[in-house]
């Protein structure tokens, strides 16, 4: 008789990733006899909720209920009916609301309340919504693109199944760029961890492992440029900022309120005989690159070594995946071939900084203005941050892998953060069975 | 919105034991941290401890460790508080009151009507 | 732990006049975790302040928090006559600690 195929024994998982500029969607599914062994969970679907991040519904949190509606419809087709009730739901916000908490902690957590009572409205398993620390994100991103590498499989492999897969179970370092915070994780190589809020130990598949991670609050690309535009306005000699990290021909007009809106700008906060002014670009990469270092205290170590600010940073080690914001800026200026060097980079934005607005506009034509003004700045931003802040030279930039997917996931914490809350990252290695429960019978 | 109801008053004589419950309403339970203060009559405010509802782990002030337990119900929302070995300076009333998410800081935003307990034999 | 002495242990003021509460702690308190409490006689605590200076939702504005280290100010702008109550403050440092009240009475 003919074989006949059993139902598909999957089960599935959805991350809200509520980041500082949108919020994201993801469903995670795997077979599920196989839930301890590496490599097997992927995404399965990636929703990007239209609007901003929770963190600007603070003054209408009526509206989330809304806002939420169309990608958790989304995630009710996709997933079978008969999962819904066994599939959790787990929500993860960042940077943007560690910074509403910093500013007000009962209204982010009025901003959460809401959320959990929407989120739980819907027939999943809702396990509730939190602000993750900046350890975690850094932590969880690391587990993500090692997990989907399949650096933490034990089987030596005489094939590569992924890009940038080097046949050794040396782990890749983490590089994650948000809108409000950016980190760096990685395993150092037998160097002493000198600061221990920078120290994780995991235990993954019957390995140890020694991982240095830090985030650095207000340092992802928007908040670093609203640190910016507070430095720079401070010696202004009036309502006009010649920016040189705008394009040549572009014009915006700031509210001061805005600029102080933010915790990270505090430092920079004086009061200033006018309610607004005029960003003015000017297009010149090198004095923007220069405006940026301002932005990194490296004058002040109190370790044998620092990324800035006073922070800690051992010798890089390895190779690095440098995943969300580093990826999509450096994937619309076509920068990230693994062939393209240091110095090419900076070449291209160099260009690219120069181009007028108006020839920017017309080359970019589908692209909102408020996002391609702003390229010229994140990635005069990226360069400044990898090279000054983290110390990678021309020739350790090679060493950077600039990833959007690995084998159709997202790199990114959300995967990561699902595999630890749902025990699917044994400490032991699991042992194997001869055969696996065969589909057909 | 959110509300905390305690349980009624109590009356019980010394050595005996008392049990008090608040029942969370208007938000997602687990999400919180749950404490119980106390207030003898005329007197201040005394804290006595507090639960996470989500994994159920507690933290005692040192004055009530060995004679307070507190536990919960996350089916129906509910925390309780169990005060053993009564004595008669153990008359106040009793409040429960929602404390921080996790990463917060502990301040204690949302308090119970309070449930007065009488110990006297 | 630390002791948190309030003070005066009462205020008589009259309507409309500027209310000065003080709380000392016997150790360094972080300024997040300084919060102030109001109770009136038969009622449960009521958060007003917290993070020594953020005034919780929905507190009217004349009620400001201020301080840092070991010394914290409650300041009522404007006594009106519904603020006549009993203030506590509190502190949070591995365990939570109120001050023994200050009672502000119609004079």
């Known amino acids: 008789t003919q074989n006949k195929a059993l139902p598909e024994n999957v089960k599935y998982g959805i991350v809200l990733d509520a980041g500082s500029s949108h919020t994201s969607l993801y469903i995670y599914k795997w077979p599920a006899e196989k839930e301890n062994d590496t490599g097997v969970v992927h995404q399965v679907e990636e929703c990007r909720v239209k609007g901003p991040g929770i963190s600007k519904f603070v003054q209408k949190v009526n509206e989330i209920g809304i806002y939420l509606t169309d990608c958790m419809e989304r995630a009710r087709e996709v997933i079978p009916r008969s999962q819904h009730q066994e599939t959790p739901v787990y929500l993860g916000a960042t940077a943007g609301m560690r910074l509403l908490r910093m500013e007000s902690e009962e209204l982010a957590d009025r901003v959460l309340d809401v959320v959990e009572r929407s989120l739980s409205n819907y027939p999943f398993d809702f396990q509730g919504a939190r602000i993750i620390t900046g350890q975690e994100e850094g932590a969880y991103g690391w587990i993500t693109i090692n997990y989907l590498l399949g650096k933490f499989s034990q089987k030596t492999r005489w094939f590569s199944i992924v890009p940038y897969e080097t046949n050794n179970q040396e782990t890749f370092g983490a590089l994650d760029l948000g809108g409000a915070s950016t980190q760096v994780t990685f395993v150092p190589q037998n160097q002493t961890i000198e600061s221990p809020d920078n120290a994780l130990q995991f235990r993954l598949y019957g390995k140890d492992y020694n991982v240095y991670t830090h985030s650095f609050l207000c340092y992802g690309k928007d908040q670093a440029l609203w640190q910016k535009l507070a430095k720079d306005i401070q010696v202004a000699s009036n309502e006009i900022l010649r920016d040189p990290c705008f394009h040549p021909g572009y014009k915006k007009v700031v509210n001061v309120s805005d600029l102080y809106k933010t915790p990270c700008t505090k430092r920079f906060e004086m009061t200033l005989p006018f309610q607004q002014f005029e960003i003015q670009g000017i297009g010149n990469y090198q004095q923007c690159h220069q405006s940026i270092l301002e932005l990194f205290n490296t004058s002040y170590c109190p370790y044998s070594q620092c990324a800035f600010n006073g922070i800690f940073l051992p010798p890089l080690q390895g190779d690095f995946g440098a995943f969300s914001a580093f990826y999509f800026v450096m994937k619309f200026l076509n920068l990230t071939s693994e062939k393209v060097s240091q110095e090419k980079v900076t070449e291209m934005m160099k260009k690219f900084c120069a181009q007028p607005w108006e020839e920017i506009k017309t080359s970019y034509a589908g692209v909102k203005e408020k996002y391609l003004s702003e390229y010229c700045f994140s990635g005069t931003y990226i360069l400044s941050l990898l090279l000054q802040g983290y110390h990678f030279t021309a020739d350790s930039w090679e060493h950077i892998h600039f990833i959007g997917k690995i084998q159709g996931s997202d790199a990114g914490w959300t995967l990561g953060y699902m595999l630890n809350l749902t025990n699917m990252i044994p400490a032991e290695q699991p042992l194997s069975t001869p055969l696996s429960h065969s589909t057909y019978v | 919105q959110v509300q905390l109801v305690q349980s009624g008053a109590e009356v019980k004589k010394p050595g005996a034991s008392v049990k008090v419950s608040c029942k969370a309403s208007?938000?997602?339970?687990?999400?919180?941290?749950m404490h119980w203060v106390r207030q003898a009559p005329g007197q201040g405010l005394e804290w006595m401890g507090r639960?996470?509802?989500?994994?159920?782990?507690?933290w005692y002030a040192q004055k009530f460790q060995g004679r307070v337990t507190m536990t919960r119900d996350t089916s129906t929302s509910t925390v309780y508080m169990e005060l053993s070995s009564l004595r008669s300076e153990d008359t106040a009333v009793y409040y429960c009151?929602?404390?921080?998410?996790?990463?917060?800081?502990?301040?204690?935003?949302?308090w119970g009507q309070g449930t007065l307990v009488t110990v006297s034999s | 732990e630390i002791v948190l002495t309030q003070s005066p242990g009462t205020l008589s003021l009259s309507p409309g006049e500027r209310a000065t509460l003080s709380c000392r702690a016997s150790?360094?308190?972080?300024?997040?975790?300084l919060a102030w409490y109001q109770q009136k006689p038969g009622q449960a605590p009521r958060l007003l302040i917290y993070y020594a200076s953020s005034r919780a939702y929905g507190i009217p504005d004349r009620f400001s928090g201020s301080g840092s280290g070991t010394d914290f100010t409650l300041t009522i702008s404007r006594l009106e006559p519904e603020d006549f109550a009993v203030y506590y403050c509190q502190q949070y440092h591995n365990a939570i600690t109120f001050g023994g009240g200050t009672k502000v009475e119609i004079k």
């Open positions: 009151a929602r404390g921080k998410r996790e990463g917060g800081t502990e301040y204690l935003r949302v």
């Open positions: 208007g938000y997602i339970f687990k999400s919180y941290e």
């Open positions: 150790q360094s308190v972080s300024s997040s975790y």
């Open positions: 639960i996470n509802p989500s994994v159920g782990s507690t």
